[in-house]
Amino acid sequence: YKLVCYYTSWSQYREGDGSCFPDALDRFLCTHIIYSFANISNDHIDTWEWNDVTLYGMLNTLKNRNPNLKTLLSVGGWNFGSQRFSKIASNTQSRRTFIKSVPPFLRTHGFDGLDLAWLYPGRRDKQHFTTLIKEMKAEFIKEAQPGKKQLLLSAALSAGKVTIDSSYDIAKISQHLDFISIMTYDFHGAWRGTTGHHSPLFRGQEDASPDRFSNTDYAVGYMLRLGAPASKLVMGIPTFGRSFTLASSETGVGAPISGPGIPGRFTKEAGTLAYYEICDFLRGATVHRILGQQVPYATKGNQWVGYDDQESVKSKVQYLKDRQLAGAMVWALDLDDFQGSFCGQDLRFPLTNAIKDALAAT
């Protein structure tokens, strides 16, 4: 099984024990590590952070010790914006320039492949996204002719039904991608006005339409029905939780909220908590399991957080094995307890290790 793990370059800026550099990553934990994100400037793939080149080197040094590890560079992301991707992909010359710029950049910096994180192609971009993938793969095949190992090509795709329908020609893009990471999280957010888990495995009994689509099981099944081969589908598991501020004394699933939860001490983003911050939150909190959805949530005062723990990730891994998927994807290593100093077990990367162990279990 693949265990595809994202690392985010901005995690270096978190203060104190939240600061994570690639040299802190366990070289034997994942089969693939994806560095997020690269930029595109003047139609050429480019660095984003001032010290990306240093961090690329740090990440790719891990391969000296684990030659089986593959590293990919992810281009795009939320801050890059869909519009900029759209302009490049829809213009033949821009697209060609971008595609041509990728292999030398990856080779220079020691990466084994590219991950496309166009979040998200619009309805009019659907065909352009397919063309971009098809042409990128053709370039990778051509570039590898002189006996080089062919560069890998993957894409991170939304798990939301509406986005899947408007953005992706699943059957076509699957032919050209080495694997597809389906982002089976962020199904529920503060925009709903109520509490709910952002990464349930199954549909909950409390769920009403449109929530019958807002779960991992539906998204995976839908992707498979649309023609994604199970052998290429890698299922996303988050090492972060989504939090809410409760608006009343109700604390269950579907309770009214006044907005996102308060920012974490390290991640400093309202409505999001890293797993290591959740471990802190759990001290003195009340933990519940949403039985049908097979995921936990916790409450403390007026704060509510839905997250994954070692039990829920094992259920998710068993599910992906049952569906004969290619493996699991983790967003993100730097949101796990990477130092092993928060979650009371001392183990570094406890969630990702639980996923790895479950994948290896017979």
């Epitope: 270096q12 040299d23 366990d26 092993g340 100093s341 077990q345 001392d346 183990l347």
Partner: antibody
């Protein structure tokens, strides 16, 4: 090749602070890796104390967290250990070290014996 | 924290003899590192990532193991191998060392 050299007092009184310097040659402490302090007690037991990362962030052994501070002077390519409120139990040979992978210690100084005694 | 128990604490071997020492972890670890220390000097990295020999380490040394059980083996003891050997992990925080196996030459 990188070399590390510890220096500091060899005798410290109980309740005082122990301060040691590690001078690094052959590699800039701001260029990469983590820079560690490890001590070896008279019975030969080894204990990792903490590190300062090239980025400046620190990580300490939880058993010492309330007493330890590791800092650096990048202009002199040195990093420092301060251990407060020492007792005779802190008598040990103190070594500075640099990692190779995140999790093991590839280069060590020769160590300096610090005795805590009245 | 993870406790590493090394056995035996002290052992002796004749030149040419095969030597095996073990390191048992109180919880599962991903891989183990080993150090050699001779009297009056700092430990030297000897074996890393369970089985890889550090630069300059003779091929008669080998390492193996997984989970909670690891070992260091010398296929044919030589006088220069007399030293104390420590195992070390950092799968869990903080990193910890074993109490050491002192290997003497007969």
């Amino acid at each position: 090749d990188v070399q590390l050299q510890e220096s500091g007092p060899d005798l410290v009184k109980p309740s005082q602070s122990l301060s040691l310097t590690c001078t690094v040659t052959g590699y800039s402490i701001t260029s990469g890796y983590s820079w560690h302090w490890i001590r070896q007690f008279p019975g030969n037991k080894l204990e990792w104390m903490g590190y300062i990362h090239y980025s400046g962030t620190t990580n300490y052994n939880p058993s010492l967290k309330s007493r330890i501070s590791i800092t650096r002077d990048t202009s002199k390519n040195q990093f420092f250990l301060q251990l407060n409120s020492v007792t005779t139990e802190d008598t040990a040979t103190y070594s500075c070290a640099r990692n190779y992978g995140y999790d093991e210690f590839a280069y060590w100084g020769q160590g300096t014996l610090v005795t805590v005694s009245a | 924290q993870i406790v590493l128990t090394q056995s035996p604490a002290i052992m002796s071997a004749s030149p040419g003899e095969k030597v095996t020492m073990t390191c048992s972890a109180s919880s599962s670890v991903s891989y183990m590192h080993w150090y050699q220390q001779k009297s009056g000097t700092s430990p030297k990295r000897w074996i890393y990532d369970t089985s890889k020999l550090a630069s300059g380490v003779p091929a008669r040394f080998s390492g193996s193991g997984s989970g909670t059980s690891y070992s260091l083996t010398i296929s044919s003891m030589e006088a220069e191998d007399a030293a104390t050997y420590y195992c070390q992990q950092w799968s869990s925080n903080p990193p910890t060392f074993g109490s050491g196996t002192k290997l003497e030459i007969k």
